[in-house]
């Protein structure tokens, strides 16, 4: 029985060349989180946080992705191509798989509002 909910930072915007924190939070379940996957809009894996093995950043993103804070992910040196959907996938037992969605908009302008509010997708 999947009782949990994923809260995410929702729709966020950040400045080109800057950095942004992607955050998800799993609540309302006692399930054990064994792994969290971070994926990009085209389904490519950015990073994995395994409960035993720790963080694994995929080679293509090693220069621009930093683990944390917590189970979150920090994207650095943002480009316009980083605009799009990001997904956090929580692998848990005994519940199974929970997935949260974040939409990131990278702005050209020198002033970009960084929204950090949490919302349930």
């Amino acid at each position: 029985m999947m009782t949990g909910t994923i809260e995410t930072t929702g729709n966020i915007s950040a400045k080109k060349g800057g950095s942004v924190i992607l955050q998800c939070h799993l609540s309302s379940t006692m399930a054990q989180v064994t792994q969290v996957n971070w994926e990009q809009h085209d389904h490519s894996l950015l990073a994995i946080r395994n409960a035993e093995l720790g963080w694994h950043i995929y080679p293509a993103f090693k220069d621009r992705v930093a683990p944390g804070p917590g189970l979150g992910l920090t994207l650095q040196s943002l480009t316009m191509n980083d605009t799009g959907e990001y997904f956090c996938t929580y692998h848990t037992y005994p519940d199974g798989t929970y997935r949260g969605r974040i939409f990131l908009e990278v702005l050209e302008s020198s002033v970009a509002e960084h929204s950090a509010r949490f919302q349930i997708p």
Partner: antibody
Framework: EEQLVESGGGLVKPGGTLKLSCAAS????????MSWVRQSPEKRLEWVAE????????YYSDTVTGRFTISRDNAKNTLYLEMSSLRSEDTAMYYC????????????WGHGTSVTVSS | DVQITQSPSYLAASPGETITINCRAN??????LAWYQEKPGKTNKLLIY???RLQSGIPSKFSGSGYGTDFTLTISSLEPEDFAMYYC?????????FGGGTKLEIK
């Protein structure tokens, strides 16, 4: 080349015990979670148990909880399934399988080892 | 547990044809369905996971679609080596459960 080789199957009486082994090669065994899946004589597949990469977390289907124990020895690149209080419905081909690094499926399977529970 | 109904259980087709195999879950499993191929004397092969993602090394003649409760495996331009047993499996929640299988045979 990734390879999984199961052994230890055989004929056992109801109530008996058996220990299956799965020898892994061709990949870094200690990085992957592993599962046991069985296939009944009627060809139905059933997930049996899973163990995390380091062995800290173990999960079981309700049908085997309390009777089966999954374990691993990363130094020996070997996965185990200890089965006790065996029943006729445990008769099946037992496969070990590797869970994908992203945890989404089972990407490599062994050829299986046959377990028959009969008096 | 999530129950998976796979259909048809038996399918006869000719080389060159395109076929579809369906799996239906009794409750939503999001996109989390995998497809496997089973052949005598060979180890089971992962074809598709997360509904539509092609496993590395699998030819693009295999494709998966679906979301929620209804999923489809499509195999185009059937070749002799494609005639085998196919299983779907949900990986959304524990226990992971499988469909009953589809035996694809040469007509």
């Amino acid at each position: 080349e990734e390879q999984l080789v199961e052994s230890g199957g055989g004929l056992v009486k109801p109530g008996g015990t058996l220990k299956l082994s799965c020898a892994a090669s061709g990949f870094t065994f200690s990085t992957y979670a592993m599962s046991w899946v069985r296939q009944s004589p009627e060809k139905r597949l059933e997930w049996v148990a899973e163990i995390s990469s380091g062995g800290s977390y173990t999960y079981y289907s309700d049908t085997v909880t309390g009777r089966f124990t999954i374990s691993r020895d990363n130094a020996k690149n070997t996965l185990y399934l200890e089965m006790s209080s065996l029943r006729s419905e445990d008769t099946a081909m037992y496969y070990c399988a590797r869970k994908t690094l992203d945890y989404y499926a089972l990407d490599y399977w062994g050829h299986g080892t046959s377990v028959t529970v009969s008096s | 547990d999530v129950q998976i109904t796979q259909s048809p259980s038996y399918l006869a087709a000719s080389p060159g044809e395109t076929i579809t195999i369906n799996c239906r879950a009794n409750k939503t499993i999001s996109k989390y369905l995998a497809w496997y191929q089973e052949k005598p004397g060979k180890t089971n092969k992962l074809l598709i996971y997360s509904g539509s993602r092609l496993q590395s090394g699998i030819p693009s003649k295999f494709s998966g679609s679906g979301y929620g409760t209804d999923f489809t495996l499509t195999i185009s331009s059937l070749e002799p080596e494609d005639f085998a047993m196919y299983y779907c499996q949900q990986h959304n929640e524990y226990p992971w459960t499988f469909g009953g299988g589809t035996k694809l045979e040469i007509k």
